[in-house]
């Protein structure tokens, strides 16, 4: 997360850290007991290595008594994910048991009216993805509240030029922005999660290149048939 | 302690801009939104928009677009607002108010400034 | 965009008593509201945020309730303090609008 701040400990307690070898490698959103939502480019970077979700985390070093260590049993990517495009960049992740849940772990709701969320409208975006330009990594959970972009101006060719599909939505980046490590978290509008980040090569906290984020209103039934 | 502090009434002509202003104090200036809002003597409240003062974005409600131009000056912790070409409906109290941030993304106006009155008169 | 309708528009009341304002938004709102209290001449104040979470320093006798299109502010036991305007205004979405107010007088 570039240009936010420091997320209160254990305020979201949806958030997930999807881990390949122990190594955080993107975000994730507990959406159910047994399953975390992430981006199907996720696990184009996990290789050959055994993903793990990490559930009720704020610091990913220190212990805490909240945080949890899943294996996972089944990986399911949206179908029709592509490597070459962030279009249905979406990813189930089927933890080996029900997660224990408490104050620290706990599903968030999910958006299933398929309309677009209004412009201007502030999202927080919140994951342990880098923090610099440099490529600073951060050790506990970062956050930010940004508007909703409308999809016209993220469309326009200085932007985004006509990339974005309704399935996606835009978040302003002028600044403050998910970025590399973020793929796959929430953005949460007021209590319920409406879209996932995508896991492009976009360049972050450029206001010429919004945040793109799968809506998962549009992916409604494929999510229901999944978790079935 | 939190404080927004407006500057002081002002009597202007029609068809003439007035600039108010609204300095904080007590937090991080640049980490919260801060929003303006009208309200015409004896009615409710009107949203005009937001700025975040760490980036200088705007949002304006679009029944505001053109009347209102929001700004930051991030070195005096002060927003501006600068209201243009004023009829005399645009006679008001017009404050300026903090987004609090509660649990994930909740948000709501949790500190306001005292309010700025705007007469708009021949 | 939203529309906030708030009721009633006045309310007389007496001291002690208990009352009810509600706020009917023209959608789901998805209990991202907030309710504030003006008196004459004062700024707002934040009473309740996310529908049912009091601001700091907010006595216990207010509470907020509801979900999905319909909510309410509740006052118990009135306090002469408690006289004045009472606003909703609703955060799911752009512009965030306010409900039409809800004036507050001592019978």
């Known amino acids: 997360i570039l240009g936010g701040r420091e997320a209160e400990a254990h305020a979201r307690p949806y958030m997930a850290s999807v881990q390949v070898n122990g190594e955080h490698l993107c975000g994730g959103v507990l959406v159910a007991e047994q399953w975390v939502l992430s981006a199907a480019h996720c696990l184009e970077d996990a290789a050959d290595g055994k993903v793990q979700v990490l559930l009720g985390a704020h610091s990913l070093s220190q212990p805490e008594p909240s945080k949890r260590l899943y294996d996972v049993l089944r990986a399911v990517p949206h179908p029709d994910s592509r490597p070459d495009t962030i279009d249905h960049d979406l990813l189930l992740l089927q933890l080996s048991e029900k997660a224990t849940l408490g104050p620290a772990v706990r599903p968030l709701p999910w958006q299933r009216v398929d309309r677009d969320v209004e412009p201007g409208t502030l999202c927080d975006v919140a994951g342990w993805g880098i923090v610099s330009h440099a490529g600073r990594r951060p050790d506990r959970l970062q956050h930010v509240l940004l508007p909703v972009l409308d999809r016209a101006t993220c469309n326009r060719r200085t932007h985004h030029d006509g990339a974005i599909t309704q399935r996606m939505m835009c978040a302003e980046s002028n600044r403050r922005d998910s970025c590399k490590g973020d793929s796959g978290g929430p953005l949460v509008c007021g209590g319920v999660l409406e879209g996932v980040v995508t896991s492009g090569s976009r360049v972050c906290g450029n206001r010429k290149k919004p945040g793109i984020y799968t809506r998962v209103a549009s992916y409604a039934a494929w999510i229901d048939s999944v978790l079935a | 302690q939190v404080q927004l502090q407006q500057s002081g009434p002002e009597l202007v002509k029609p068809g003439a801009s007035v600039k108010i202003s609204c300095k904080a104090s007590?937090?991080?200036?640049?980490?919260?939104?801060i929003n303006w809002v009208k309200q015409r003597p004896g009615q409710g409240l009107e949203w005009i928009g937001w700025?975040?003062?760490?980036?200088?974005?705007?949002y304006y409600n679009e029944k505001f677009k053109g009347k209102a131009t929001l700004t930051v000056d991030k070195s005096s912790s002060t927003a501006y607002m600068l209201l243009s070409s004023l009829p005399s409906e645009d006679s008001a109290v017009y404050f300026c108010?903090?987004?609090?941030?509660?649990?994930?993304?909740?948000?709501?106006?949790?500190?306001w400034g005292q309010g700025t009155s705007v007469t708009v008169s021949s | 965009d939203i529309q906030m309708t708030q009721s009633p528009a006045s309310l007389s009341v007496s001291v002690g008593e208990t009352v009810t304002i509600t706020c009917r938004a023209s959608?789901?709102?998805?209990?991202?509201l907030a309710w504030y209290q003006q008196k004459q001449g004062k700024s707002p104040q934040l009473l309740v945020y996310?529908?049912?979470n009091l601001a700091d320093g907010v006595p216990s006798r207010f509470s907020g309730s509801g979900s999905g299109t319909q909510y309410s502010l509740k006052i118990n036991s009135l306090q002469s303090e408690d006289f004045g305007s009472y606003y909703c205004?609703?955060?799911?979405?752009?512009?965030?609008?306010f409900g039409g107010g809800t004036k507050l007088e001592i019978k």
């Open positions: 108010a903090r987004y609090g941030y509660y649990g994930s993304s909740f948000y709501a106006m949790d500190y």
């Open positions: 205004q609703h955060f799911w979405g752009s512009p965030p609008t």
């Open positions: 996310a529908a049912t």
């Open positions: 700025i975040f003062p760490g980036s200088g974005s705007t």
């Open positions: 007590g937090y991080t200036f640049t980490d919260y939104y």
């Open positions: 959608e789901n709102i998805y209990s991202n």
